[in-house]
Interface confidence: low
């Protein structure tokens, strides 16, 4: 036997108090699918949250964050304070990145500069609080006649000249 409530479309609920008549969702509530016995309360974008999309009878409100803050978590469940580039957010507020670290965004943590020497490369441009170092070619790559994309020459065989 078909459930009579299945005929109730999104934006309504199946009202048991009225012999399973489909009633519109009350103000500040919604149902995003048909056949629901209750409507869900709309999310309220209070305080640090701002309304990005108003609640309707068929869809929940969507929040974002007031300027100076950014969303975190699924569906913008939290707002976190922005910092400047070159800073990270700590429990005591925005703090400058320590020497040797950088942050090129308004959010997130300070990350260590790339260690160019790990790849056998030189530092072409020094890092700052806001920018990572730029690694240059390795000293071997700069030797006369070498190309930074040429692989090392194989061992020479008789009758062959080096590449």
């Amino acid at each position: 036997l078909q459930d009579p409530c299945s005929n109730c479309p999104a934006g309504t609920f199946c009202d048991n108090n009225r012999r399973q008549i489909c009633s519109p969702c009350p103000p500040n509530s919604f149902s995003s699918a048909g056949g629901q016995r209750t409507c869900d309360i709309c999310r309220q974008c209070k305080g640090v949250f701002r309304t990005r999309k108003e609640c309707s009878s068929t869809s929940n409100a969507e929040c974002d964050c007031t300027p100076g803050f950014h969303c975190l978590g699924a569906g913008c469940s939290m707002c976190e304070q922005d910092c400047k580039q070159g800073q990270e957010l700590t429990k005591k507020g925005c703090k400058d990145c320590c020497f040797g670290t950088f942050n090129d965004q308004k959010r997130g943590i300070c990350r260590p500069w790339t260690n160019c020497s790990l790849d056998g490369k030189s530092v072409l441009v020094n890092g700052t609080k806001e920018r990572d170092v730029v690694c240059g070619p390795s000293p071997a790559d700069l030797s006369p006649g070498a190309s930074s994309v040429t692989p090392p020459a194989p061992a020479r065989e008789p009758g062959h000249s080096p590449q």
């Epitope: 640090v48 300027p67 922005d82 910092c83 925005c94 703090k95 308004k106």
Partner: antibody
């Protein structure tokens, strides 16, 4: 106890640039925003602009081209600069702390600015 | 920018009277509305935020209501210290804007 104290020149000549400082005590500028508000004699409050904890700013669209708000977190100071002054800029200038729930919970006492030659 | 309109611009009432001040927004602002009190000496204080939440230390005779575009500040029983100018302020959209103010005097 959180306190905000404005300090300004008092008298400024037309076409010059106004510079006012708001010194904040008992509260960190890395945790709260500061909004500037002015009140011409006998008139209502007018929001000028805000500087957020991270340093970004928003300005009153009608005054945007003349306004600059900046801050020095280490000195706990926020400054307002307004260029090309006219007599219409004569007002009491207030700074106010902006909380994370977007109200101005602490206000300075205000500083009077008169634009006159 | 969102325009905020207050009425009346001034009013005179007797001690103990119930006083209501209206504030209207040029577009819907949900409940993103605050009320401030400015004393004759220029001191400004927050009274109510988010339409109806009383700020700490504010007497319970003050209350706020409304939603969307129309809002009300009510003083249930007027006291001598309530002589002031009252301002509404929206924070739905930047730039945040104030109403023109309502000057409250005692008869």
């Amino acid at each position: 106890q959180v306190q905000l104290q404005e300090s300004g020149p008092g008298l400024v000549k037309p076409s010059e640039t106004l510079s006012i400082t708001c010194t904040v005590s008992g509260s960190s500028l890395t945790s709260y925003g500061v909004h500037w508000v002015r009140q011409p004699p006998g008139k209502g409050l007018e929001g000028l602009g805000v500087i957020w904890p991270g340093g970004s700013t928003n300005y009153n669209s009608a005054l945007m081209s003349r306004l600059t708000i900046s801050k020095d977190n280490s000195k706990s100071q926020v400054s307002l600069k307004m260029s090309s002054l006219t007599a219409a800029d004569t007002a009491m200038y207030y700074c106010a702390r902006v909380t994370g729930t977007w109200y101005f919970d602490v206000w300075g006492q205000g500083t009077t600015v008169t634009v006159s030659s | 920018d969102i325009q905020m309109t207050q009425s009346p611009s001034s009013l005179s009432a007797s001690l103990g009277d119930r006083v209501t001040i209206s504030c209207s927004a040029s577009q819907g602002i949900s409940n993103y509305l605050n009320w401030y009190q400015q004393k004759p000496d220029g001191t400004v204080k927050l009274l109510i935020y988010y339409t109806s939440t009383l700020h700490s230390g504010v007497p319970s005779r003050f209350s706020g209501s409304g939603s969307g575009t129309d809002f009300t500040l009510t003083i249930s029983s007027l006291q001598p210290e309530d002589v002031a100018t009252y301002y509404c302020q929206q924070y739905s959209k930047l730039p945040w804007t104030f109403g023109g103010g309502t000057k409250l005097e005692i008869k």
